[in-house]
Amino acid sequence: YSNFRKSVDSTGRRQYQVQNGPCSYTFLLPETDSCRSSSSPYMSNAVQRDAPLDYDDSVQRLQVLENILENNTQWLMKLENYIQDNMKKEMVEIQQNVVQNQTAVMIEIGTSLLNQTAAQTRKLTDVEAQVLNQTTRLELQLLQHSISTNKLEKQILDQTSEINKLQNKNSFLEQKVLDMEGKHSEQLQSMKEQKDELQVLVSKQSSVIDELEKKLVTATVNNSLLQKQQHDLMETVNSLLTMMSSPNSKSSVAIRKEEQTTFRDCAEIFKSGLTTSGIYTLTFPNSTEEIKAYCDMDVGGGGWTVIQHREDGSVDFQRTWKEYKEGFGSPLGEYWLGNEFVSQLTGQHRYVLKIQLKDWEGNEAHSLYDHFYLAGEESNYRIHLTGLTGTAGKISSISQPGSDFSTKDSDNDKCICKCSQMLSGGWWFDACGPSNLNGQYYPQKQNTNKFNGIKWYYWKGSGYSLKATTMMIRPADF
């Protein structure tokens, strides 16, 4: 009997089996394992993709395809030989005994073989076309690369030459810089030496000035003491002469009071006979702590303790709470005596405050308050003033009732802003108020429309920054 069946083996290859009586013939058809399946991005008969593969990859795949083709060819030849050699005997029997359906089986097998061969040929044609396409693309790429390489080489040459030029320039400039550095270092050295010499000179002069200041103060004091002693001697002589001329008078011994050595204010100094304006040492009430102040012994009968003075903008008045508390500046020029001393002094006796002002047009004015005192630090040195008279305005330019003192680091005003920062300087700001004698100093012709100048509204109006100011105090009973 004869029969025919198609099946797939365990490796997935197709096989054709022909059973003819006791003989069985199995044909294993080759599979194109080396070709990628259609799910691959490189389908065997797909259109070539745009992006070229790497050259080495293409060559390698070409070799693989050639091997497959060669294998297929060899296999076909083997199959042909096998059919010719081994089937001759059986073919005779088959030809004798074959029935019509086995012929059909053979035809089917042949057809299948032809189909397989045709498919392989088509695939090879596709691969050849791809290889040609790929080769052309690679050649074009190589050509482009060589052109680009030539361009790059030219650019590199140009850049190399530019770099050489720049290096030459660099070397030249480096040399110049080195030369200049040498000169500069020499000049710097010379300047440093000069600076050192000047510093030595300045320190010498400073010490000389300090000595001279001390001598001046001593001389002033001595002069005043001599004047007082002369005055006392004259009085004693006159007294003695009077006594001598009176025959009934009893002899008496003149007992001099012990010389006062410490003074709480300039009024005491004046009363002690020292009537020359200048710097004097004052002592804090109920303390041994001392402070230097300028005493005005000329204005309005003398005895004035100067607590503030502005004249040229040489001292910065935008200071801290501590500095305004303790005082700053120079009593010979611009200065602030110190809130603590003034508070203690005016808290013990009744004092008057006189404020002298000068504008840039040569005019002078003053305000006199018949009672002035500062509260203690716990009350932010709040100012208290009554009884205004004078020529610098009928209304007080220091807000009434008195405000607390404010500085850049201690905001105690009544403004939503920070007056001391906005207007500059420490002052008894309201919100911010009609005055600020500790404002920014502005020179002539730059002193109008100023928001932070030295202001006394009820004399010169808003925005006018004054030329000079002096605040001074004296006991009300002087």
């Epitope: 939503i416 906005m422 009609p434 429309n449 928001f451 509204y457 808003s462």
Partner: nanobody, 129 residues
């Protein structure tokens, strides 16, 4: 240098209108309040109107309410005073002045005259038939 320049004054009949301008330089209107003041011969300078916060807050003296309108154009850094229904008693030199907007007493809305530190030269307004 802060400068304020007024313009727009002149002679007008009672019931007439004028528009005054105040051009500011050296300051920006964002940070300052601008006030209009007037001073008639032999009288104290008085506040007429003021503006701050880009027009968000305005002030008018009772004597000019309903007749005068203050406005500002920050792009031109200029403040205007539109004066309608003018009366002979409005005759005066009109000044504009500037004050830092923050210089306000707690709880207050407007500024005393002494807080205005920058002033213009003034422009004369005469209301007469």
């Amino acid at each position: 240098e802060v400068q304020l320049v007024e313009s727009g004054g002149g002679l007008v009949q009672p019931g007439g209108s004028l528009r005054l301008s105040c051009a500011a330089s050296g300051i920006t209107l964002d940070d300052y309040a601008i006030g209009w003041f007037r001073q008639a011969p032999g009288k104290e300078r008085e506040g007429v109107s003021a503006i701050r916060d880009n027009g968000g807050s305005t002030y008018y003296a009772d004597s000019v309410k309903g007749r005068f309108t203050i406005s500002s154009d920050n792009s031109k850094n200029t403040v205007y005073l539109q004066m309608n229904s003018l009366r002979p008693e409005d005759t005066a030199v009109y000044y504009c002045a500037a004050v830092p907007a923050g210089r306000l007493r707690y709880g207050e809305q407007w500024y005393p005259i002494y807080e205005y530190d920058a002033w213009g030269q003034g422009t004369l307004v005469t209301v007469s038939s």
